[in-house]
């Protein structure tokens, strides 16, 4: 039956991809989509993309928002399109912050799997406020 779609591997979703690591693409495909916001040198850094490997996003997606970084993950085609990660409010805004969209991204490839994906690792999401 042509309509039958056996599950031989985890479901993949189309995700919005925004940032330097996305190259010329505005989307990627993965087992989870994400939208993140981090603070880097006082700038708000917004990123969107996908985790091709589920385990890659597992810890990152479970990490609660901190003053310097927040990640929201979802599963579903284009589910991160209308998601904007929010930093936890502390009653006042961070001094001197500006919104700079799609800044300071790194391309993380899954070497073990030979990937050419628009991926971001937990380390990368924390990269900005560790510096």
């Amino acid at each position: 039956m042509e309509d039958e779609k056996p599950k031989v591997n985890p479901k993949l979703y189309m995700c919005v991809c925004e940032g330097l690591s996305c190259g010329n693409e505005d989307h990627c495909e993965g087992q989870q989509c994400f939208s993140s916001l981090s603070i880097n040198d006082g700038f708000h850094v917004y990123q969107k993309g996908c985790f091709q490997v589920y385990e890659q996003g597992k810890m990152t997606c479970k990490t609660p928002p901190s003053p310097g970084q927040a990640v929201e993950c979802c599963q579903g085609d284009w589910c991160n399109r209308n998601i904007t990660a929010q930093l936890p409010t502390k009653g006042k805004s961070f001094p001197g912050t500006q919104n700079f969209h799609l800044e300071e991204q790194k391309l993380i490839s899954e070497e073990d799997l030979g990937g050419e994906q628009k991926l971001i690792s937990e380390e990368d999401l924390h990269h900005h406020h560790h510096h």
């Epitope: 056996p6 693409e25 990937g115 050419e116």
Partner: antibody, heavy 114, light 113 residues
Framework: QVQLVESGGGLVKPGGSLRLSCAAS????????MSWIRQAPGKGLEWVSY????????YYADSVKGRFTISRDNAKNSLNLQMSSLRAEDTAVYFC???????WGQGTLVTVSS | KIVLTQTPLSSPVTLGQPASISCRSS???????????LSWLHQRPGQPPRLLIY???NRLSGVPDRFSGSGAGTDFTLKISRVEAEDVGVYYC??????????FGGGTKVEIK
């Protein structure tokens, strides 16, 4: 009905290059990710490479990484595998397969020998 | 990388008799989403492989009910209740849990005695 037809196989010297193609018909090509899987003579199956529906995501087995490049042309319903720096151990029948490995082509034989 | 080990390498069977193939994984194939992506394929000589069973025990439509899959975690079994002539060939287990890095077992050849 779903049809996948591979072409481009042949005899090539070690270090040489070859480009395999897979012509797809009978389904909406752009709705499915595609894979190349190979089988050395008398041996088992080995996954080689994968490409997502739009071609934005590509993955390779360690054994071919840096030497093989997968691509697709959704307008032409075609899948390609550019193979370079070929080695004797790349000798195999190469199958293209459609998600979720429910449909396979008949394969094309690549022989790497001097 | 997940390694799948199949036993036996070869299984000579009498027509109408049962056959059983084992597939052992080097690590659990239970995915974080709860599913276990272990499939079985059958390859007749000179033909491409054909998917028979997915997620351990689900038969593809058109696959005879004499084929059944079972197991959990790292140990899986394909059983043919009564082998018919058309069942000869090589059977492979395959894991998709670590997708996109699919891996296959080494294969088990089923032949008629």
């Amino acid at each position: 009905q779903v049809q996948l037809v591979e072409s481009g196989g042949g005899l090539v010297k070690p270090g040489g290059s070859l480009r395999l193609s897979c012509a797809a018909s009978g389904f909406t090509f752009s709705d499915y990710y595609m894979s190349w899987i190979r089988q050395a003579p008398g041996k088992g199956l080995e996954w080689v490479s994968y490409i997502s529906r739009t071609g934005s995501t590509k993955y390779y087995a360690d054994s071919v990484k840096g030497r093989f490049t997968i691509s697709r042309d959704n307008a032409k319903n075609s899948l390609n595998l550019q193979m370079s720096s070929l080695r004797a151990e790349d000798t195999a029948v190469y199958f293209c397969a459609r998600e979720p490995l429910q449909h396979w082509g008949q394969g094309t034989l690549v022989t790497v020998s001097s | 990388k997940i390694v799948l080990t199949q036993t036996p390498l070869s299984s000579p069977v009498t027509l109408g008799q049962p056959a059983s193939i084992s597939c052992r994984s080097s690590q659990s194939l239970v995915h974080s989403d709860g599913d276990t992506y272990l499939s079985w394929l059958h390859q007749r000589p000179g033909q491409p492989p054909r998917l028979l069973i997915y997620t351990i025990s689900n038969r593809l439509s058109g696959v005879p009910d004499r084929f059944s899959g079972s197991g959990a975690g790292t140990d899986f079994t394909l059983k043919i209740s009564r082998v018919e002539a058309e069942d000869v060939g090589v059977y492979y287990c395959m894991q998709g849990t670590q997708f996109p890095a699919l891996t296959f077992g080494g294969g088990t050849k089923v032949e008629i005695k």
